[in-house]
C-alpha cells in the first residue's frame, strides 16, 4: 500500500481511568494530512463517534476509560498530498494499585513515571495529562505516600508541584489526580510518578561538611573583639558559596552601617581529595545585643552556627 | 494576570542612590522567590540579586555585593532593591521576575531605567 | 563564575528552516539552564527550563537539550515572529550568568 512503516516505542497504561496518544510525528503532520486509526492492522478505522468508549477525535485516539482488554497495537496512517506514513504504537494495559484500595487508598494508577529532584533548588514535578481539547482537565491535587500533599515548601501551579529547597526527604512515591470531563461524564485520572533525589547539591554543586561551627554557643566577655572560623571541606571542583549570615541576611549587610561584625576573606588550602576553606567572622566588640542571636555559617546547603553566651559569673 | 510593576529608576549621579520598587498581582507572592535581571545599553543581561520567598535568603553576584540590597514585603506584595554607590556601569534597565524554580524567570515586569552619570 | 558562551552571536535564516544556538558552559551545570526570547522593545520571555522543558504556552516547534556543559536550543520550522534575541541563563551556581545572546535575521 506504499505506506512507510514507524514503530513506536511501547506505552505501559492503567486500567479504569482515560487516557489519549496523539498521532504527530513531525515533520509529516506539520502540512495537509489526513489522520486515521486503526486496531491491531483491521482494515476497519477506530469510531469517530464521540459516544464510543474508544474514539478519533482529530489526530487522537481516545479511550474513556482505557480498559484490560484494550492492550494491543494500533496504527495511525498519515496522508499527505505526495506521502503515507504508518506509525504503530504497542499498547500494554494491566492493574495497577498504588496504595491498597482495600483500605481506602488512591485508586489505579497509569503510567509509573520517574522523575528527579534535585537537592537544594526550588525544583517542580510535572503531572503529564496529555489528552485532546475536548477533554477539560480540573485542578490538580498532588499525594506523596498516599497522603495530600501540603505545606509551605508546596505549590501547586498548573500542571507541576513546585518544590522549594528540595530535601533527602522528598524522594518517594508521588502521584497527582485530576477529574477530567467529556461530554458531560467525569473521569478521574491519577499518574504515579517516582521520585528521586539528585545528590548533586543545588546553589553549588556538592554537598559540603562544615568541620566548624558545630551548633554551639560561645561564651565571650562583653567588649571584646572575636574572630570565629567557619571550617569547611568541599570537592576541588565545587562551585558553593560560604559566608555568614545574621537574621537571614549576609552578616557584611546586615551591619553595613557600623561594619562591627565583618566576614573576613575566604582562604582554602588543597588536599588531594578536597579543598579545605576558612572564612572567618569578626566581631570587633561584643555588644549585649548579639548575645543570644545565632550567627549561621552557609556553605552550599549547609548550615551550622554559633551563639554568644555571657560567661557564668565567677563567684570565686 | 501576573502583572509586576517596576518604579524608582531615574538619573543620579555616580556614588547616589536609587531605591527600586516592582509591585506584584495576580499571584500568590509569597510563596515564589524573586529576582533583580538587567540589561545593559548594549543588550547584555545580567543577573543582579535573587530573594527567596520567605525572606530567609538573598544572592547576589560580587559586582553588586555590599551596594544592592534585595528585600521584600509580603504584606504588600512588594520586591524592593536599595543601590548604594551606583557606577556608571550599573546603567540599564532593571526587571524584577517571579521565580517559579530555580533560575526559571516566568513573569517579568516591563522594567525601569536607572541611568547613572555625572 | 561560570561562563557561559552562546553561539552563533548572529545567525542568517530563512522561514521553514530549522536553527540551532548552543550554550557552552565553562564546567557542569547539570541540567539548570533556561532559555529566553526577547523581541525588540520587549522583555524577555520564558522558553525552556531545565534545558528541555517547554513553559507552558510555548508552541512545539521550539526545543531545548543537553546537561554538563553543553546545550542546544532548536527552533524547527521557523516563523517570521521567531526573528528575534535568544539567551540562555545558567542557574547551578551563584553568580548565575547569561550567555551573550544570538540574534536571528532573515536570510
Known amino acids: 500500500d506504499g505506506c512507510k512503516d514507524i514503530f513506536m516505542k511501547n506505552e505501559i497504561l492503567s486500567a479504569s481511568q482515560p487516557f489519549a496518544f496523539n498521532c504527530t510525528f513531525p515533520p509529516i503532520t506539520s502540512g495537509e494530512v489526513s489522520v486515521t486509526w486503526y486496531k491491531n492492522s483491521s482494515k476497519i478505522p477506530v469510531s469517530k463517534i464521540i459516544q464510543s468508549r474508544i474514539h478519533q477525535d482529530e489526530t487522537w485516539i481516545l479511550f474513556l476509560p482505557m480498559e484490560w482488554g484494550d492492550s494491543g497495537v494500533y496504527q495511525c496512517v498519515i496522508k499527505g498530498r505526495d506521502s503515507c506514513h504508518r506509525i504503530h504504537v504497542n499498547l500494554t494495559v494491566f492493574e495497577k494499585h498504588w496504595c491498597d484500595t482495600s483500605i481506602g487508598g488512591l485508586p489505579n494508577l497509569s503510567d509509573e513515571y520517574k522523575q528527579i529532584l534535585h537537592l537544594g533548588k526550588d525544583d517542580s514535578l510535572t503531572c503529564h495529562l496529555h489528552f485532546p481539547k475536548s477533554c477539560v482537565l480540573g485542578p490538580i491535587k498532588w499525594y506523596k505516600d498516599c497522603n495530600e500533599i501540603k505545606g509551605e515548601r508546596f505549590t501547586v501551579l498548573e500542571t507541576r508541584l513546585l518544590v522549594s529547597n528540595v530535601s533527602a526527604e522528598d524522594r518517594g512515591n508521588y502521584a497527582c489526580q485530576a477529574i477530567l470531563t467529556h461530554s458531560g461524564k467525569q473521569y478521574e485520572v491519577l499518574n504515579g510518578i517516582t521520585v528521586s533525589i539528585t545528590e548533586r547539591a543545588g546553589y553549588g554543586g556538592s554537598v559540603p561538611k562544615i568541620i566548624y561551627p558545630k551548633n554551639h554557643s560561645i561564651e565571650v566577655q562583653l567588649g571584646t573583639t572575636l574572630i570565629v572560623d567557619c571550617n569547611v571541606t568541599d570537592t576541588k571542583d565545587n562551585t558553593n558559596l560560604r559566608c555568614w549570615r545574621v537574621n537571614n541576611t549576609l552578616v557584611d549587610d546586615y551591619y553595613d552601617e557600623s561594619k562591627r561584625i565583618r566576614e573576613g576573606v575566604e582562604t582554602h588550602v588543597s588536599f588531594r581529595e578536597h579543598n579545605l576553606y576558612t572564612v572567618n567572622i569578626t566581631f570587633l566588640e561584643v555588644k549585649m545585643e548579639d548575645y543570644g542571636l545565632p550567627f549561621m555559617c552557609h556553605a552550599g546547603v549547609s548550615t551550622a552556627y554559633i551563639i554568644l553566651q555571657l560567661p557564668a559569673p565567677d563567684f570565686r | 494576570e501576573v502583572m509586576l510593576v517596576e518604579s524608582g529608576g531615574g538619573l543620579v549621579k555616580p556614588g547616589g542612590s536609587l531605591k527600586l520598587s516592582c509591585a506584584a498581582s495576580?499571584?500568590?507572592?509569597?510563596?515564589?522567590?524573586m529576582s533583580w535581571i538587567r540589561q545593559t545599553p548594549e543588550k547584555r543581561l545580567e543577573w543582579v540579586a535573587t530573594?527567596?520567598?520567605?525572606?530567609?535568603?538573598?544572592y547576589y553576584p560580587d559586582s553588586v555585593k555590599g551596594r544592592f540590597t534585595i528585600s521584600r514585603d509580603n504584606a504588600n506584595n512588594t520586591l524592593y532593591l536599595q543601590m548604594r554607590s551606583l557606577r556608571s556601569e550599573d546603567t540599564a534597565m532593571y526587571y524584577c521576575?517571579?521565580?517559579?524554580?530555580?533560575?526559571?524567570?516566568?513573569?517579568w515586569g516591563q522594567g525601569t531605567l536607572v541611568t547613572v552619570s555625572a | 563564575e561560570i561562563k557561559m558562551t552562546q553561539s552563533p552571536s548572529s545567525l542568517s535564516a530563512s522561514l521553514g528552516d530549522t536553527i540551532t544556538i548552543t550554550c557552552r558552559a565553562s564546567?557542569?551545570?547539570?541540567?539548570?539552564l533556561t532559555w529566553y526570547q526577547q523581541k525588540p522593545g520587549n522583555i524577555p520571555k520564558l522558553l525552556i527550563y531545565?534545558?528541555?522543558n517547554l513553559h507552558t504556552g510555548v508552541p512545539p516547534r521550539f526545543s531545548g537539550s543537553g546537561s554538563g556543559t553543553d546545550f542546544t536550543f532548536t527552533i524547527s520550522s521557523l516563523q517570521p515572529e521567531d526573528i528575534t534575541t535568544y539567551y540562555c541563563?545558567?542557574?547551578?551556581?551563584?553568580?548565575?550568568?547569561f550567555g551573550g545572546g544570538t540574534k536571528l535575521e532573515i536570510k
Open positions: 521576575a517571579i521565580m517559579i524554580t530555580t533560575g526559571e524567570h516566568a513573569y
Open positions: 495576580g499571584i500568590t507572592f509569597s510563596r515564589f522567590a
Open positions: 530573594i527567596s520567598s520567605g525572606d530567609m535568603y538573598t
Open positions: 564546567q557542569d551545570i547539570s541540567v539548570w
Open positions: 531545565k534545558a528541555s
Open positions: 541563563l545558567q542557574s547551578q551556581s551563584y553568580p548565575w550568568t
